[in-house]
């Protein structure tokens, strides 16, 4: 049995550079007890986007829209998309822990920048 | 329907132990967080343990870590609460409580009473 | 721990009147926008039954009499108009972060 999944909807999403790009992100439980964070790219050299409880992302905002029972919203807007920002983003749920652990992430959605 | 239903409460020695079982109907209970509240006329409604649908991971508060162990069978829909070195403060009504989100509580049942007294 | 104080501690209100009771957290329950504050009715001799989930969210069967707002620290559940059957303690809880914590739960009376 699933303890928990964590659903990205969207594989892709299209923006237009100066826009505003929201990336979904639908968790279906609590448990495992940890954070959520988002990541550009995987593997160890991955970019960390959003961290609910640490650091400084002033291009970030949280956007929950579901009012479900069945699942929490951790879902994000990324203002003023530039080309470089282009790339895979994954939505990752961790364990917590000393230190937390990855426990599961999302199937990532691919973010495409379009010319103004 | 739904129905969560208690059992194995009663009255025990300090010191002593309880098992108390929760028996699940009316719902997918392999999908469902599981918890136990307690509820005291002095301290009200107080978290008492978590376990994950899957049953690998439990959460208990510090007030009764160490002595209490949840456990569950989802091929039996049944939750189980092992209760050892009972103490008077561990005097309550327990509930049973399911989760679908490891969130709110979404239903209770009965309660079934432990008196921890010498 | 995250504490949560609810106000007042009993309330008497005229049938068909408002009812609000508030329920203040220690720290933010909010997490990416979703308040992990949860409302629960309790009757006599009753297991507590759930109301509103994540501050503002009507529970499946439950009279729209009811509703919940807030966020971060600050939450509000009001009953309008109230009615006799809605004679009994109400109490929030946080699931933002462990242990999970409780009010101290508000009784509500007809005047």
């Known amino acids: 049995e699933e303890e928990l999944q964590v659903i990205q909807p969207d594989k892709s999403v299209s923006v237009a550079a100066g826009e505003s790009a929201i990336l979904h992100c639908t968790v279906t439980s609590l448990i495992p007890v940890g954070p959520i964070q988002w990541f550009r790219g995987a593997g160890p050299a991955r970019e960390l986007i959003y961290n609910q409880k640490e650091g400084h992302f002033p291009r970030v905002t949280t956007v929950s829209e579901s009012t479900k029972r069945e699942n929490m919203d951790f879902s994000i807007s990324i203002s003023n998309i530039t080309p470089a920002d282009a790339g895979t983003y994954y939505c990752v749920k961790f364990r917590k822990g000393s230190p937390d652990t990855e426990f599961k992430s999302g199937a990532g959605t691919e973010l495409s920048v379009r010319a103004k | 329907e739904v129905q969560l239903v208690e059992s194995g409460g009663g009255l025990v020695k300090p010191g002593g132990s309880l098992r108390l079982s929760c028996a699940a109907s009316g719902f997918t209970f392999s999908s469902y967080v599981m918890s136990w509240v307690r509820q005291t006329p002095g301290k009200g409604l107080e978290w008492v343990a978590t376990i994950s649908s899957g049953g690998t991971y439990t959460y208990y508060p510090d007030s009764v870590k160490g002595r209490f162990t949840l456990s569950r069978d989802n091929a039996k829909n049944s939750l189980y609460l092992q209760m050892n070195s009972l103490r008077a403060e561990d005097t309550a009504v327990y509930y049973c409580a399911s989760q679908l989100t490891g969130s709110e509580f979404d239903y209770w049942g009965q309660g079934t009473t432990v008196t921890v007294s010498s | 721990d995250i504490v949560l104080t609810q106000s007042p501690a009993s309330l008497a209100v005229s049938l068909g009147e408002r009812a609000t009771i508030s329920c203040r957290a220690s720290?933010?329950?909010?997490?990416?926008?979703?308040?992990?504050m949860h409302w629960y009715q309790q009757k006599p001799g009753q297991p507590p039954k759930l109301l509103i989930y994540?501050?503002?969210n009507l529970e499946s069967g439950v009279p729209d009499r009811f509703s919940g707002s807030g966020s971060r620290t600050d939450f509000t559940l009001t009953i309008n108009p109230l009615q006799a059957e809605d004679v009994a303690t109400y109490y929030c809880h946080q699931s933002a972060d462990l242990p999970w914590t409780f009010g101290g739960g508000t009784k509500v009376e007809i005047k």
């Open positions: 720290e933010s329950v909010d997490s990416y926008g979703n308040s992990f």
């Open positions: 994540r501050a503002s």
